[in-house]
Amino acid sequence: QQAPYWTHPQRMEKKLHAVPAGNTVKFRCPAAGNPTPTIRWLKDGQAFHGENRIGGIRLRHQHWSLVMESVVPSDRGTYTCLVENAVGSIRYNYLLDVLERSPHRPILQAGLPANTTAVVGSDVELLCKVYSDAQPHIQWLKHIVINGSSFGADGFPYVQVLKTADINSSEVEVLYLRNVSAEDAGEYTCLAGNSIGLSYQSAWLTVLPEEDPTWTAAAPEARYTD
């Protein structure tokens, strides 16, 4: 026999859910134990079945989830999943805030990503901080050269998608470049989008050869410049 435990605690790290009105919210508390535990939900400490909620709720016990569609300000509160079996119980609190302000294009923090200089063989991190009412999606792009040209006939740059991610609002998104070589030098773009539109900012990575005399032994592996 075993008391309940969280099977995917990394999926529960986002405690505060700040969601625009009209959106769908999903809380999950994936758990296991022996015997198989049951899950129930509380709102602000009271048993929550959604009977007073317009549109009700969806409880998917096999997914350990609570789903509320078209959230409104009255849905704000603390939602607790209570998982229990004969051996013991565990609980986790989610905080829901329903936002009513005007959703806007993603806003990228000025100066990020930052122009960076690194030595061949070192590791580089490019940062992008996004502020968005709606959940943003991010792409990291590298500007590339095709047939000796950086731009197509339409005047737009050639880009290669390096990474795509859906992130939580106000998270820092990082592009890791390991063991950089001269070929990694160039322009990198952080592109953030939501249902309203896209925003993007770029930075240049300069890669210096290992034996470059201007690079002192005491210098850090990667240097960030504006």
């Epitope: 625009p20 009209g22 959106n23 769908t24 078209s70 005007s102 959703p103 806007h104 294009r105 806003i107 990228l108 000025a110 709606a134 959940q135 999606h137 792409q139 792009l141 339409d154 737009f156 740059p157 880009v159 998608v161 795509t164 773009t189 592109l191 989008g193 939501n194 249902s195 309203i196 539109g197 896209l198 925003s199 993007y200 900012q201």
Partner: antibody, heavy 124, light 112 residues
């Protein structure tokens, strides 16, 4: 060819419901946010609602909030607008409009492709 | 909500002559990424709006170079350098920076 084709318009009495559809073709529908915009007879343009590429985010104009629901079926390349509790002032041509995509914007990031529109008349 | 105010209401232009339409927003449309999110459309009789200019001054593909957009922050202008008969229609500006997206009231362009 990139195309949006609206359907479902018609004449309906105040208080009743109507469901509009928009069939998309010629582009990867599931990668784009989608909007509805309407235009009352002889009047200007009014934005109605938007839905994100995956349906997880929806926003509405105050004038339709609580009455209209925007939804999408990416497996069928279809955008919908469920209109309940219709009012006389909802009478308009309803346009389906492509919004922002998920990738690098080779041109405008949305509001470039409009459907031909479908007419909704709310009258007793 | 951002209010978009367009002037004039209507414009009667001789073919070959220039035309200018103004649009003012109640808040700045200059975004943190350095772009100004004002769009211009023309709507011809019985048709949906057609995009002319995006992000203040970029001509959409297929739009003749006699159309140009300019301005900054809250004041925007659409210019037609030499009006042609096919330019007849109602012109709208739109802000595309936040929801609700809002349009100007329209400017009707006719040929003298």
């Amino acid at each position: 060819e990139v195309q949006l084709l609206e359907s479902g318009g018609g004449v309906v009495q105040p208080g009743r419901s109507l469901r509009l559809s928009c069939a998309a073709s010629g582009f990867t529908f599931s990668s784009y946010a989608m909007h509805w915009v309407r235009q009352a007879p002889g009047k200007g343009l009014e934005w109605v609602a938007v839905i994100s590429y995956d349906g997880s985010n929806k926003y509405y104009a105050d004038s339709v909030k609580g009455r209209f629901t925007i939804s999408r079926d990416n497996s069928k390349n279809t955008l919908s607008l469920q209109m309940n509790s219709l009012r006389v002032e909802d009478t308009a041509i309803y346009y389906c409009v492509r919004g922002a995509g998920r990738g690098y914007p080779y041109g405008p990031d949305g509001f470039d492709i409009w459907g031909q529109g479908t007419m909704v008349t709310v009258s007793s | 909500d951002i209010v978009m105010t367009q002037t004039p209401l209507s414009l009667s232009v001789t073919p070959g002559q220039p035309a200018s339409i103004s649009c003012r927003s109640s808040r700045s449309l200059l975004h943190s990424d350095g772009k100004t999110y004002v769009y211009w459309y023309v709507q011809k009789s019985g048709q949906p709006p057609q995009l002319l200019i995006y992000e203040l001054s970029n001509r959409f593909s297929g739009v003749p170079d006699r159309f140009s957009g300019s301005g900054s922050r809250t004041d925007f202008t659409l210019k037609i350098s030499r009006v042609e008969a096919e330019d007849v229609g109602v012109y709208y500006c739109m802000q595309y920076i936040e929801a609700p997206l809002t349009f100007g009231g329209g400017t009707k362009v006719e040929i003298k």
